[in-house]
Interface confidence: medium
């Protein structure tokens, strides 16, 4: 990747990621420098007849660093603080090739939940206020609500009116997704409204 447009790489929190390195064709590589947020991470000197010399210069990430045969960087047990800018400089006798990456650490989405605040009107129409959430959501998580394949909301929240006298049974599905995972959770309007109706008639007695 040219330094102008870094390759965006998604890593999953706690898992491993590889930043792929491409070599200049047919040129002998003198050394490779890997940088993280402009700070030296590792210095590699390849050898044709023996194992390469690898000098890890960042002790913080050092134990979690590895390199493939082609000197691509592998980072394991990813942490949120691994997010940032990575660069690899390949130096040959005649030139220096720069590869840039932006690593983004995303959480595998977990524990999708729907909370419901509903009310029953005197005309027996049920109004559902549904809120969808996932554990540790951030700005990279998008939510949407669907019913019968149609998008009803592009937010974690959905407000719908449901009339048991004229509406057929209806499921509403919340879909939460980020670049590495997606989750869905469906609720039945009929079931939710029946629950509200029971509460409503209980309190009226």
């Amino acid at each position: 990747q040219s330094s102008l447009t870094p390759l965006m790489v998604n890593g999953i929190l706690g898992e491993s990621v590889t930043l792929p390195l491409e070599f200049p064709a047919g040129e002998k590589v003198n050394f490779i420098t890997w940088l993280f947020n402009e700070t030296s991470l590792a210095f590699i000197v390849p050898h044709e007849t023996k194992s390469p010399e690898i000098h890890v210069t960042n002790p913080k990430q050092g134990k979690r660093l590895n390199f493939t045969q082609s000197y691509s960087l592998q980072l394991s047990n990813l942490k949120m603080e691994d997010t940032g800018s990575y660069r690899a400089q390949i130096s040959t006798k005649t030139s220096a090739k720069l590869s840039s990456y932006t690593l983004r650490i995303l959480r595998q989405l977990r524990n999708i939940q729907v909370t419901n605040h509903s009310q029953l009107f005197q005309n027996m129409t049920c109004e559902l206020h549904l809120t969808c959430s996932v554990e540790d959501a951030d700005d990279n998580v998008s939510f949407r609500w669907e019913a019968l394949g149609n998008t009803l909301s592009s937010q974690p929240n959905l407000t719908v009116s449901w009339d048991p006298r004229i509406s057929s049974e209806q499921d509403y599905t919340c879909i939460a997704e980020n670049a590495v995972s997606n989750l869905s959770f469906s609720v039945s309007a009929q079931k939710l409204c029946e629950d509200v109706k029971i509460q409503y008639t209980d309190t009226k007695m």
């Epitope: 965006m8 998008s142 609500w145 669907e146 998008t151 909301s153 592009s154 937010q155 974690p156 407000t159």
Partner: antibody
């Protein structure tokens, strides 16, 4: 049918403030977030961010933090973009656009042309 | 941010000519999150093709979209006068959301 109607063109002096409105109709306003997009000849279409129309939470793109503010008048199904301390480079067309599912810009307002000049 | 590079920047085509506009992403994009917009002079952009290949309502069948990963394209089977416009690709999976710089299509 779904419509987004924006306020008219505006001419402002540098250092002043402008507030652009976007009136939504034809759908449940609080179910769909509202994006704001800037279009200029120099930089093309740039996403400024969006506001959650249910809880009012704005999200700003990095280039639009500080000087810009999104707000709502939910009862009037209207979203607002306020630009403070206007600069010449704020001269552009500004669009509101309704979010929808995996499509971020399903419906667009007609645009508001802002000219900043002394 | 993810950079979307469109080519060509400007293109003049004769009526009936087949046209292909490409959109190259600096990072792989799920096909569900790559969309195309058409903008005619003096108007706002309009959703044109969404999720890589689905034509928006009212879009003529001579248009099609395809692609995956980092390479996407919009094709017009046979250019017509009403197709004169700018076409923008847009990705919606990485924040910030980004647009290509646009391809301006003109009539020869």
């Amino acid at each position: 049918q779904i419509q987004l109607v924006q306020s008219g063109p505006d001419l402002k002096n540098p250092g002043k403030t402008v507030k652009i409105s976007c009136k939504a109709s034809g759908y449940t306003f609080t179910n769909f977030g509202m994006n704001w997009v800037k279009q200029s000849p120099e930089r093309g279409l740039k996403w400024m961010g969006w506001i959650n129309t249910y809880n009012g939470k704005p999200t700003y793109a990095d280039d639009f933090k500080g000087q810009f503010a999104f707000s709502l008048e939910t009862s009037a199904t209207t979203a607002y973009l306020q630009i403070n301390n206007l600069k010449n480079e704020d001269t552009a067309a500004y669009f509101c656009a309704k979010r929808g599912g995996t499509v971020d810009f399903g419906y667009w307002g007609q645009g508001t042309t802002l000219t900043v000049s002394s | 941010e993810v950079v979307l590079t469109q080519s060509p920047t400007t293109m003049a085509a004769s009526p009936g000519e087949k046209i292909t506009v490409t959109c190259s992403a600096s990072s792989p994009i799920s096909s569900n999150f790559l969309h195309w917009y058409q903008q005619k002079p003096g108007f706002s952009p309009k959703l044109f093709i969404y999720r890589t290949s689905i034509l928006a309502s009212g879009v003529p069948a001579r248009f099609s979209g395809s692609g995956s990963g980092t390479s996407f394209s919009l094709t017009i089977g046979a250019m017509e006068a009403e197709d004169v416009a700018a076409y923008y690709c847009q990705q919606g999976i990485y924040m910030p959301l980004t647009f290509g710089a646009g391809t301006k299509l003109e009539l020869k």
